[in-house]
Amino acid sequence: LQDPCSNCPAGTFCDNNRNQICSPCPPNSFSSAGGQRTCDICRQCKGVFRTRKECSSTSNAECDCTPGFHCLGAGCSMCEQDCKQGQELTKKGCKDCCFGTFNDQKRGICRPWTNCSLDGKSVLVNGTKERDVVCGPSPADLSPGASSVTPPAPAREPGHSPQ
């Protein structure tokens, strides 16, 4: 026997209280699939959240963050404060990166400068709070008679906060 509720399309629910007829989702709710016995409450984008996509009877609202904040978590479940480049967010707010670390984004953590000597290279450009060091050719490559200069290694890309 086919479930009569399977005929109810997205945007409706199968009303247990009215002989399982398909009723439209009430305001501020949605059903994104057919055959639902309840419509779900729309997400509301309040406070630091702003509406990226309005809720409809067939799809939930989508939020992003107001300027000065960025999304974290699945579906932008949280908004985290932006910091400046050269800073990271701590429990006490934005703090400058410690010496020897950098952050070239408005989010995420300060990361250690690349250690050029581990690759047998020299420091071509010193690091700052906002930028990683740029490693140059190895000292051997700079000796007289060396036929070519190794191109500088690319600056390491810092990790992102989870999205």
Epitope: F13, D15, N17, N28, I41
Partner: antibody, heavy 121, light 106 residues
């Protein structure tokens, strides 16, 4: 008959987490949404959020988004709420309550007996 | 969020008296639900969608109202009606409750 049976009282230290359960019987678990509410001593009832056991969809009161996690196990008809980073203000009775979403009225027609959570160092 | 303000906070009544409890919303809502709670017990569904009595609720109870003003009325109050009554809305997320009216029967 329709029943919601909640897990027993808990005593926790600040910063800890607690996970409580709500076992449903006497009805089809996936046909109704399950809500969680907080009643702190001398405070108003507060809605924490709900889960639709059929789809797993959750919707939270923004006040609790960061610390409450709602889940449901269809195989055992049990809903769960985990509350993390506990603080003294979380000392309260927590209720699960069923809502017949198909009435579109979001009315809590059946309530659990409550789980008392005490947060104390 | 929509704030529900109940009045009075506390009411003392004598048996057979008529009791009226009011719930005012900070902005218009589609309907109000009412719950009864006795000490040491969970809240119980009492009136849904403004005026529909839950199963087993005596007919001396009634509910009415619209927009921002709703009332629960007990026509001839009895001793067993001593409890705290809460109103609740969901016209806007999140669900919110009034802080309750405690009814004492002398």
């Amino acid at each position: 008959q329709v029943q919601l049976v909640q897990s027993g009282a808990e005593v926790k230290k600040p910063g800890a987490s607690v996970k409580m359960s709500c076992k449903a019987s006497g009805y089809t678990f996936t046909f109704y949404t399950m809500h969680w509410l907080k009643q702190a001593p001398g405070q108003c009832l507060e809605w924490i959020g709900y889960i639709n056991p059929s789809s797993g969809y959750t919707n939270y009161n923004q006040k609790f988004t960061d610390r409450a996690t709602l889940t449901a196990d269809k195989s055992t008809s049990t809903a769960y709420m985990e509350l993390s980073s506990l603080r003294s203000e979380d000392t309260a009775v927590y209720y699960c309550a069923r809502s017949d979403g198909s009435s579109s009225k979001w009315y809590f027609d059946v309530w659990g007996q409550g789980t008392t959570v005490t947060v104390s160092s | 969020e929509i704030v529900l303000t109940q009045s009075p906070d506390f009411q003392s009544a004598t048996p057979k008296e008529k009791v009226t409890i009011t719930c005012r919303a900070s902005s218009s809502v589609s309907y109000i639900h009412w719950y009864q709670q006795k000490p040491g017990s969970s809240p119980k569904a009492w009136i849904s969608a403004t005026s529909n009595l839950a199963s087993g609720v005596p007919s001396r109870f009634s509910g009415s109202g619209s927009g921002t003003s709703y009332t629960l009325t007990i026509n001839r109050v009895e001793a067993e009606d001593a409890a705290t009554y809460y109103c609740q809305q969901w016209s806007s997320n999140p669900f919110t409750f009034g802080c309750g009216t405690k009814l004492e029967i002398k």
